[in-house]
């Protein structure tokens, strides 16, 4: 005969655990139902009655199956240097990320504490490493034979066009100028762009373990070292 299915609340067999989406209530000493995401426990179970769940109120949420007496408050509205990439719903918290063209310069357990504008490489310098959601752009001087004539956080150094006859030689910040005869090889018009980073940072990130050399204080998520600002510029 098949085993009889127990309905919550029920007393578990000695040494056994409650089933999926159930929890053991210490007071009732019974296995009781958890509440689904978007709900919370309005009334805890007893020996004779199961958990009574209720929907989360506005601006509160529960993301997991739970038996919490109150839903969690959604975070504050996003700061003006951030954008809301996920709205507060009954089942998930609001997520704020740095706005496009910015990156997270300092993370804390609550999410991004400081957003900063991505470095712009000035003429004569191109992007060596694009910015990400947590790291700044790295600029590098344009090597001989390449140039960048823009102030940009995305443009890389481009090769000079190759002329049959050079009118003005190119340099790090200017393309070569050919005489009226067309160049033998030319780059496609327009600057070469690197893709902007896509931000996915949650407002409530888990802290990473500290490196063994870290100070003993409760610490932020460390970022990698930043290059010097040579070749970068403000707006």
């Amino acid at each position: 005969l098949p085993a009889q299915v127990a309905f919550t609340p029920y007393a578990p067999e000695p040494g056994s655990t409650c089933r999926l989406r159930e929890y053991y209530d210490q007071t009732a000493q019974m296995c009781c139902s958890k509440c689904s995401p978007g709900q919370h426990a309005k009334v805890f179970c007893t020996k004779t009655s199961d958990t009574v769940c209720d929907s989360c109120e506005d601006s509160t949420y529960t993301q997991l199956w739970n038996w919490v007496p109150e839903c969690l408050s959604c975070g504050s509205r996003c700061s003006s240097d951030q954008v809301e990439t996920q709205a507060c719903t009954r089942e998930q918290n609001r997520i704020c990320t740095c706005r496009p063209g910015w990156y997270c310069a300092l993370s804390k357990q609550e999410g991004c504490r400081l957003c900063a504008p991505l470095r712009k490489c000035r003429p004569g310098f191109g992007v060596a490493r694009p910015g990400t959601e947590t790291s700044d752009v790295v600029c590098k001087p344009c090597a001989p034979g390449t140039f960048s004539n823009t102030t940009s956080s995305t443009d890389i150094c481009r090769p000079h066009q190759i002329c049959n006859v050079v009118a003005i030689p190119g340099n790090a910040s200017m393309d070569a100028v050919c005489t009226s005869t067309s160049p033998t090889r030319s780059m496609a018009p327009g600057a070469v762009h690197l893709p902007q980073p896509v931000s996915t940072r949650s407002q409530h990130t888990q802290p990473t373990p500290e490196p063994s050399t870290a100070p003993s204080t409760s610490f932020l998520l460390p970022m990698g070292p930043s290059p010097p600002a040579e070749g970068s510029t403000g707006d």
Partner: antibody
Framework: QVQLVQSGAEVKKPGASVKVSCKAS????????LSWVRQAPGQGLEWMGW????????NYAQNLQDRVTMTTDTSTSTAYMELRSLRSDDMAVYYC?????????????????WGQGTMVTVSS | DIVMTQTPLSSPVTLGQPASISCRSS???????????LNWLQQRPGQPPRLLIY???NRFSGVPDRFSGSGAGTDFTLKISRVEAEDVGVYYC?????????FGQGTRLEIK
């Protein structure tokens, strides 16, 4: 006690560079950020940028980004601020200020300890 | 950039009397982490600035309890319950909610 001691006054010609030091003592250097703030004679305070002493990351005020570099020497608990291509309007008292922003929970998130200031005169 | 505007720019006060300085920001200083990073600094003549109040209303260590901060969002106030001679100087509000960090233009407190 916790303190920041800055290098002495400097007199520079326009176009030159200046490097101001700020030696920290009495606290764990790596656990804090350091900001640099300047004050022109008779004027208010202007934020120049900051350095995260833990990892060396920097962010600068956009109007100074081309000319300023902030560094640290963790072995001596000293921060440095170099300003290049000096102009007459760079004449100011330059302050370093500890920024209690790195610790996770009980930080003030404010500039809580200030150096005594370094006067930089730019004159031809 | 967030612009910080202080009023008044100068405040003559009688010793033992209260004083109040207002600071208004051009946009809300409430961070997405729920904190409001508005601080008050005091700069006595010939000295570096000194932190008085952080996160709107928290007195920094060693600051006398006659100093208090209040406010929310974009409007903040520093109050001195009974002005003493050593309180003479310039008071600045500053926001560290977001880059760039900005300061108010300063309020000069002087004795009548």
């Amino acid at each position: 006690q916790v303190q920041l001691v800055q290098s002495g006054a400097e007199v520079k010609k326009p176009g030159a560079s200046v490097k101001v030091s700020c030696k920290a003592s009495g606290y764990t250097f790596l656990s804090y950020g350091l900001s640099w703030v300047r004050q022109a004679p008779g004027q208010g305070l202007e934020w120049m940028g900051w350095i995260n002493a833990y990892n060396g990351n920097t962010n600068y005020a956009q109007n100074l980004q081309d000319r300023v570099t902030m560094t640290t020497d963790t072995s001596t608990s000293t921060a440095y601020m170099e300003l290049r291509s000096l102009r007459s309007d760079d004449m100011a008292v330059y302050y370093c200020a500890r920024w209690d922003i790195l610790t996770a929970y009980y930080s003030s998130d404010a500039f809580d300890i200030w150096g005594q200031g370094t006067m930089v005169t730019v004159s031809s | 950039d967030i612009v910080m505007t202080q009023t008044p720019l100068s405040s003559p006060v009688t010793l033992g009397q209260p004083a109040s300085i207002s600071c208004r920001s051009s946009q809300s200083l409430v961070h997405s982490d729920g904190n409001t990073y508005l601080n008050w600094l005091q700069q006595r003549p010939g000295q570096p600035p000194r932190l008085l109040i952080y996160k709107v209303s928290n007195r920094f260590s060693g600051v006398p309890d006659r100093f208090s901060g209040s406010g929310a969002g974009t409007d903040f106030t520093l109050k001195i319950s009974r002005v003493e001679a050593e309180d003479v100087g310039v008071y600045y509000c500053t926001q560290t909610t977001q880059f760039p960090i900005t300061f108010g233009q300063g309020t000069r407190l002087e004795i009548k």
